[in-house]
């Protein structure tokens, strides 16, 4: 009767069990961008690293051409951080002649991409003007939340603007999902 | 045969079953930093609450010295939030006479130490530009992602200006990590 | 002796396993806030969507009047985003005109209200001065952290100024939790 | 209203030990850090350390590091200060200060304790 | 080690203006926590005039004032009065966390 203390009962598991170790996850990490070709209202997605140093995908989640492939459906939790640097806008400069503005604007879009929708679905954004007066600035825009992803979906994110991304350490801008 | 529905089938387990309550979790929260000399060019590490308030750890996750030691092999989900807070930095006088310059920062960095290697990794990195031209200012810089660790490595927080982090209350301050 | 490789050992499992499909989880996304009076020294609560488009509540965990209703006793992670946007502030006026001041803010609060305790608790808090000169600003606060949750704990987001908050889209502005 | 009432004055040989209490009153006692401060006849300012009356925590000035102990009674919402191993540079009026925690600030002080080390 | 350098006095008439000044030894003065200043009148503990380098605490006149400009920080007395002689210290909190007290300055007014 010894083993009845880790038998789930029936009110407890809806679902077969699962060794935590077998589930589908990925931590990527930022590369130098290659110029590429964007439509001009469409925010241009990044490609990431996914074996080199901190980064891995393992258990079937697949990265590929700048996607994240969800292998199995379930709840994931999907996080991402990207670093801005950038010199002082054009913000600052009419600022100073006490002119009031629309400001410059920094966002990151981690989208979701379902092959049977004709559009996208943006599940998380992070945006944020930038009124910068010193000579150049930086900043992170984090993200993270849990979504109910299906087999087969596709996850990306997007940038407002690819030249401003800090590229150049794998620690300042990342992106990743595991399965719960 | 009904019990069959909850048995795990050799393609979904490849790692032994384990129950959730037992995996290594600490959420530390922030303590005022006691005087301490640190090298100039080394960003200094904080010390923090293990036990009391909202801070504990559980399942032979172990704090000691600045330290988050790491019980088991695994990927965790490693997390930390440093409020910053400070007066008005030089960099808004020198704008203000209209010169540019090289803007104030600040930075938090979540590393891992391997007893094995002889550098630290950098596992994540939030800095931000700070050009603040107000009597006082204060702001947060949040990290967490998912890493694959192994048992005996220690996590540490480290930050570029310790004198700059607000250390007075748990909610504001704080460093975690559990076992996926 | 097969079946061996997937048995816990009484040394591993100290709790019943369960399905990691039926564990308590919820997202909520941001709606337009309805006018409520509060008390002066008091942040308001913020109301959710929590079963349109990409929020959802899932095993016992139920959202109600502004409350996320903890179901099971447990280590839950907990997030939320939320993002402000606001004109220029006083601050900026008063800082072009040479004298110093208090900046404004902008600060949002996961609290714990559990009822046998007449006070609630703070478990994260993310706060920001805001001292903005373009003639608008925007920007997101992000919190997560992990915490020893009872059953019956309510969990909220508060905001230092509910008309600040941008309710216009669901991935601007969330809240969340999951049972580890 | 908040108040810092501490102990009366003392003389202590060298090498000896004393120890200073400061008792508060008129607020939550582990609400907030309480430091010390000296000023020897005719001097400044010297800041000695911190003490965190809820954790017990405490902070110490280089200077003072493994001769001064700073700890609380939070059943009596008293501090103390001990400083052991006194010299005659010690003598000293010794002040303790509640902080303002946004701050850092010392915004109540108590009316200070005359220490005087002779042989 | 910063050191916070002040004048060992300063005098003024009744009526008059007088400021004191702190100087740091590192690069910004006070960049936490800011610049605090107390005043300590004969005999008696010191009480906090000016905290962040400008913000007087309630109670405190605003004939005292407070600013800052690189690695200096000012404290501003206008309208002197007789009732204002003592000793004035600065403070501020180092980059090692120790609390630093300048060496303070003896305030005479005259007459």
């Known amino acids: 009767l010894k083993g009845q203390e880790f038998a789930p009962s029936h009110q407890q598991v809806y679902a077969p069990l699962r060794a935590d170790g077998d589930k589908p996850r990925a931590h990527l990490t930022v590369v130098r961008q290659t110029p590429t070709q964007h439509f001009k209202n469409q925010f241009p997605a990044l490609h990431w690293e996914h074996e080199l140093g901190l980064a891995f995908t393992k258990n079937r989640m697949n990265y590929t051409n700048k996607f994240l492939l969800i292998p199995e459906s379930g709840d994931y939790f999907i996080y991402s951080q990207v670093t801005f640097r950038g010199m002082t806008s054009e913000c600052s400069e009419i600022r100073q002649a006490g002119r009031p503005n629309k400001p410059d604007s920094i966002t990151v879009v981690i989208t979701k991409v379902t092959d049977s929708y004709p559009e996208p679905t943006q599940l998380l954004m992070g945006t944020k003007s930038v009124c910068e007066v010193g000579s150049n600035w930086f900043q992170p825009i984090y993200l993270g939340a849990m979504f109910s992803l299906q087999e087969g979906d596709k996850l990306m994110v997007n940038v407002s603007d690819i030249s401003l991304v800090d590229y150049t350490k794998e620690d300042k801008t990342f992106f990743g999902a595991f399965l719960l | 045969l009904k019990g069959q529905e909850f048995a795990p089938s050799h393609q979904q387990v490849y790692a032994p079953l384990r129950a959730d309550g037992d995996k290594p979790r600490a959420h530390l929260t922030v303590v005022r930093q006691t005087p301490t000399q640190h090298f100039k060019n080394q960003f200094p590490a904080l010390h923090w609450e293990h036990e009391l308030g909202l801070a504990f750890t559980k399942n032979r996750m172990n704090y000691t010295n600045k330290f988050l030691l790491i019980p088991e092999s695994g990927d965790y989900f490693i997390y930390s939030q440093v409020t910053f807070r400070g007066m008005t930095s030089e960099c808004s006088e020198i704008r203000q006479a209209g010169r540019p310059n090289k803007p104030d920062s600040i930075t938090v960095v979540i590393t891992k130490v391997t007893d094995s290697y002889p550098e630290p990794t950098q596992l994540l990195m939030g800095t931000k530009s700070v050009c603040e031209v107000g009597s006082n200012w204060f702001q947060p810089i949040y990290l967490g992602a998912m890493f694959s660790l192994q048992e005996g490595d220690k996590l540490m927080v480290n930050v570029s200006d310790i004198s700059l982090v607000d250390y007075t209350k748990e909610d504001k301050t704080f460093f975690g990590a559990f076992l996926l | 002796l097969k079946g061996q490789e997937f048995a816990p050992s009484h040394q591993q499992v100290y709790a019943p396993l369960r399905a990691d499909g039926d564990k308590p989880r919820a997202h909520l996304t941001v709606v337009r806030q309805t006018p409520t009076q509060h008390f002066k020294n008091q942040f308001p609560a913020l109301h959710w969507e929590h079963e349109l488009g990409l929020a959802f509540t899932k095993n016992r965990m139920n959202y109600t009047n502004k409350f996320l209703l903890i179901p099971e006793s447990g280590d839950y992670f907990i997030y939320s985003q939320v993002t402000f946007r606001g004109m220029t502030s006083e601050c900026s006026e008063i800082r072009q005109a040479g004298r110093p001041n208090k900046p404004d803010s902008i600060t949002v609060v996961i609290t714990k209200v559990t009822d046998s305790y007449p006070e609630p608790t703070q478990l994260l808090m993310g706060t920001k001065s805001v001292c903005e000169v373009g003639s608008n600003w925007f920007q997101p606060i992000y919190l997560g952290a992990m915490f020893s949750l009872q059953e019956g704990d309510k969990l909220m987001v508060n905001v230092s100024d509910i008309s600040l908050v941008d309710y216009t889209k669901e991935d601007k502005t969330f809240f969340g939790a999951f049972l580890l | 209203q908040v108040q810092l009432v501490q102990s009366g004055a003392e003389v202590k040989k060298p090498g000896a030990s004393v120890k200073v209490s400061c008792k508060a009153s008129?607020?939550?006692?582990?609400?907030?850090?309480i430091n010390w401060v000296r000023q020897a006849p005719g001097q400044g300012l010297e800041w000695m350390g911190w003490l965190n009356p809820n954790s017990g925590y405490t902070g110490y000035a280089q200077k003072f590091q493994g001769r001064v102990t700073m700890t609380a009674d939070r059943s009596t919402s008293t501090a103390y200060m001990e400083l052991s191993s006194l010299r005659s540079e010690d003598t000293a009026v010794y002040y303790c200060?509640?902080?303002?925690?946004?701050?850092?600030?010392?915004?109540?002080w108590g009316q200070g304790t005359l220490v005087t080390v002779s042989s | 080690q910063s050191v916070l350098t002040q004048p060992p006095s300063v005098s003024g008439a009744p009526g008059q203006r007088v400021t004191i000044s702190c100087t740091s030894s590192?690069?910004?003065?006070?960049?936490?926590?800011?610049v605090l200043w107390y005043q300590q009148l004969p005999g008696t503990a010191p009480k906090l005039l000016i905290e962040g380098y400008y913000n007087r605490p309630s109670g405190v006149p605003d004939r005292f004032s407070g600013s800052k400009s690189g690695t200096s920080a000012s404290l501003t007395i206008t309208g002197l009065l007789p009732e204002d002689e003592g000793d004035y210290y600065c403070?501020?909190?180092?980059?090692?966390?120790?609390?630093?007290f300048g060496g303070g300055t003896k305030l005479t007014v005259l007459g």
């Open positions: 008129g607020y939550t006692f582990t609400s907030y850090d």
């Open positions: 590192s690069s910004d003065i006070g960049a936490g926590l800011g």
């Open positions: 200060a509640r902080e303002v925690p946004e701050t850092a600030a010392f915004e109540y």
């Open positions: 403070q501020s909190w180092d980059g090692t966390l120790s609390a630093l």
